[in-house]
């Protein structure tokens, strides 16, 4: 499907508006520190060039690859070395090494100021004054903070962002209309970013085979009526889409995603009965809807799995002839029968099955050797079931905030070397599994909980990779993608950790805490809790609870005081002394 000019091809396929938006996202994800105006200038230059290629595909440079064109453009940025340091060395390389170099310098935790939401009237004025710039700025700010955000999905978020302002800036109570919508977009956006980050980590750290296995399991759960060949085709196409997006090939990714949505909708009769509504929507909504569509009903009277995968005399022959296809069939058949299992559990079962066949098919009596393979699955299934049961009970007993605190303590004791902000962020997100999943019936709890935990633990893994401080984190993150959660669950208190020196400054609070939102106040308290555990890793739950209760009372008291700052200074000293005594510091 060769085109004389790739840039012209993508411009024509995507249209000018999407082309410009995707180039802006691509540039902001690569050069995360560059000012907005510089990016807009680069995007306009690329767009004008693309238009010349649409007019004449044989024009000069129109035959160059997108990586060459975009890389050349990024390398014209004057302040590259001052702003990005060694990333500037990428520009001395040729493609494809130059693009790989840019990818390696993407920063999951860029040193950027927190996005502060202006007053509603200020936002509405900015929106009305220059809608185009306002929306571009949204794309830019999200993309630079989330360098792996799924670009075609970000276009969908931007469309909803625009719709929110269009509707609410005309409303009688603008704030009441707009703020909940913006909160929802922010929360959904963070979740979407984290889910995509796991897909990219899966592809980049564990390879295409790992991603395809994940996709076979998930699509088989979602489309249990589809034939294996159909699922395989969807997996191949989906893998191409995500490989492109994770590799920075955003134009190709968006174009291929649109083609995939078109194919799914044209073939919904052989895929799923749940796609009808999705397929009536416009492109961006359609693709989003398909990605989130509920599982179809399982076909009635599916035969036992044992017939083809244990009892058949052809198991080893079939496995030897096409190992990955046979394992793919196993995964497909198991997953379509088990929407109640997490994808990672299904992958663990497939791995166990593979390991058994590798061993048994080379044995003297293969069938005798693998006859009981399904019995090996039982403990693998029970482990997450029990863990979820215990943690949902704890969540229901404590509520979200205190459940997060329990996880903060648990994880700080496991990996105390990890930075406090990372421990707070990750543990807070781990704690959200309770309100997200524990409300579900048994049949939906495990896929909700364990697959969500995989996303959150991947955040820990990518943040830790930037500044590795714990061999235990590195080990759990790199050994096996599907066993990350069991690996972290199995970690006990790190006995090798030397407690942090006590620093009173860490526990000094000021009146500004009183004006913070409830969420920000929780984060302050949780930060203090992590620091406490780092000082006293052997502190008991009761000791920590007592100190935290005292701390909460102290904040409440001083925030009610007339002279807040004095209260924080004097009462704070007393609290620190009492805490030290209580914990034996």
């Amino acid at each position: 499907d060769a085109h004389k000019s790739e840039v012209a091809h993508r411009f024509k396929d995507l249209g000018e508006e999407n082309f410009k938006a995707l180039v802006l996202i691509a540039f902001a994800q690569y050069l995360q520190q560059c000012p907005f105006e510089d990016h807009v200038k680069l995007v306009n230059e690329v767009t004008e060039f693309a238009k010349t290629c649409v007019a004449d595909e044989s024009a000069e440079n129109c035959d160059k690859s997108l990586h060459t064109l975009f890389g050349d453009k990024l390398c014209t940025v004057a302040t590259l070395r001052e702003t990005y340091g060694e990333m500037a060395d990428c520009c001395a390389k040729q493609e494809p090494e130059r693009n790989e170099c840019f990818l390696q310098h993407k920063d999951d935790n860029p040193n950027l100021p927190r996005l502060v939401r202006p007053e509603v009237d200020v936002m509405c004025t900015a929106f009305h004054d220059n809608e185009e710039t306002f929306l571009k700025k949204y794309l830019y700010e999200i993309a630079r903070r989330h360098p792996y955000f799924y670009a075609p999905e970000l276009l969908f978020f931007a469309k909803r962002y625009k719709a929110a302002f269009t509707e609410c800036c005309q409303a009688a109570d603008k704030a009441a209309c707009l703020l909940p919508k913006l909160d929802e977009l922010r929360d959904e956006g963070k979740a979407s970013s984290a889910k995509q980050r796991l897909k990219c980590a899966s592809l980049q750290k564990f390879g295409e085979r790992a991603f395809k296995a994940w996709a076979v399991a998930r699509l088989s759960q979602r489309f249990p009526k589809a034939e294996f060949a159909e699922v395989s085709k969807l997996v191949t196409d989906l893998t191409k889409v995500h490989t492109e997006c994770c590799h920075g090939d955003l134009l190709e990714c968006a174009d291929d995603r649109a083609d995939l949505a078109k194919y799914i909708c044209e073939n919904q009769d052989s895929i799923s009965s749940k796609l009808k509504e999705c397929c009536e929507k416009p492109l961006l909504e359609k693709s989003h809807c398909i990605a989130e569509v509920e599982n179809d009903e399982m076909p009635a009277d599916l035969p036992s799995l044992a017939a083809d995968f244990v009892e058949s005399k052809d198991v080893c022959k079939n496995y030897a002839e096409a190992k990955d296809v046979f394992l793919g069939m196993f995964l497909y058949e198991y997953a379509r029968r088990h929407p109640d299992y997490s994808v990672v559990l299904l992958l663990r079962l497939a791995k166990t099955y593979e390991t058994t066949l590798e061993k048994c098919c080379a044995a003297a009596d293969p069938h005798e050797c693998y006859a009981k393979v399904f019995d090996e699955f039982k403990p693998l299934v029970e482990e997450p079931q029990n863990l979820i049961k215990q943690n949902c009970e704890l969540f229901e007993q404590l509520g979200e905030y205190k459940f997060q605190n329990a996880l903060l303590v648990r994880y700080t004791k496991k990996v105390p070397q990890v930075s406090t902000p990372t421990l707070v962020e990750v543990s807070r997100n781990l704690g959200k599994v309770g309100s997200k999943c524990c409300k579900h019936p048994e049949a939906k709890r495990m896929p909700c909980a364990e697959d969500y935990l995989s996303v959150v633990l991947n955040q820990l893994c990518v943040l830790h990779e930037k500044t590795p401080v714990s061999d235990r984190v590195t080990k759990c993150c790199t050994e096996s993608l599907v066993n990350r959660r069991p690996c972290f669950s199995a970690l006990e208190v790190d006995e090798t950790y030397v407690p942090k020196e006590f620093n009173a400054e860490t526990f000094t609070f000021h009146a500004d805490i009183c004006t913070l939102s409830e969420k920000e106040r929780q984060i302050k308290k949780q930060t203090a809790l992590v620091e406490l555990v780092k000082h006293k890793p052997k502190a008991t739950k009761e000791q920590l609870k007592a100190v935290m209760d005292d701390f909460a009372a102290f904040v409440e008291k001083c925030c009610k005081a007339d002279d807040k700052e004095t209260c924080f200074a004097e009462e704070g000293k007393k609290l620190v002394a009492a805490s030290q005594a209580a914990l034996g510091l």
Epitope: A229, N318, A320, V325, F326, M329, A362
Partner: nanobody, 123 residues
Framework: EVQLVESGGGEVQPGGSLRLSCAAS????????MVWVRQAPGKGLEWVST????????VYAESVKGRFTISRDNAKNTVYLQMNSLRAEDTAVYYC????????????????RGQGTLVTVRP
């Protein structure tokens, strides 16, 4: 493009031996399982033997077990079939084959196959 070229066939007396070879190209041989199938005059395709990508797993049809040995050399992109104690009923065209994406496992008509090499066993 996938190419499989068989050689080593010929005429042999009952109880004799032959070694068939199959040179492969156009695909990643070292990650592909390989198969020998045969077609006797006027009959359909019959599976003979399979060897896994790393040669750890070998499987044989009951009719050839103990007489035939499949092997491979990944450095040479070649698969072999050592045939001993040959019988009249082993007379057939022998094909080397490998799985073709999208086909059903064991549906040898749909696999990539070579042009075959004729083995004739007669007194």
């Amino acid at each position: 493009e996938v190419q499989l070229v068989e050689s080593g066939g010929g005429e042999v007396q009952p109880g004799g031996s032959l070694r068939l070879s199959c040179a492969a190209s156009g695909f990643t041989f070292s990650t592909s399982g390989m198969v020998w199938v045969r077609q006797a005059p006027g009959k359909g395709l019959e599976w003979v033997s399979t060897i896994s990508d790393d040669a750890r797993i070998t499987v044989y049809a009951e009719s050839v077990k103990g007489r035939f040995t499949i092997s491979r050399d990944n450095a040479k992109n070649t698969v072999y079939l050592q045939m001993n104690s040959l019988r009249a009923e082993d007379t057939a065209v022998y094909y080397c084959a490998t799985y073709r994406a999208g086909s059903r496992i064991g549906s040898y008509e749909d696999y990539y196959r070579g042009q075959g090499t004729l083995v004739t066993v007669r007194p």
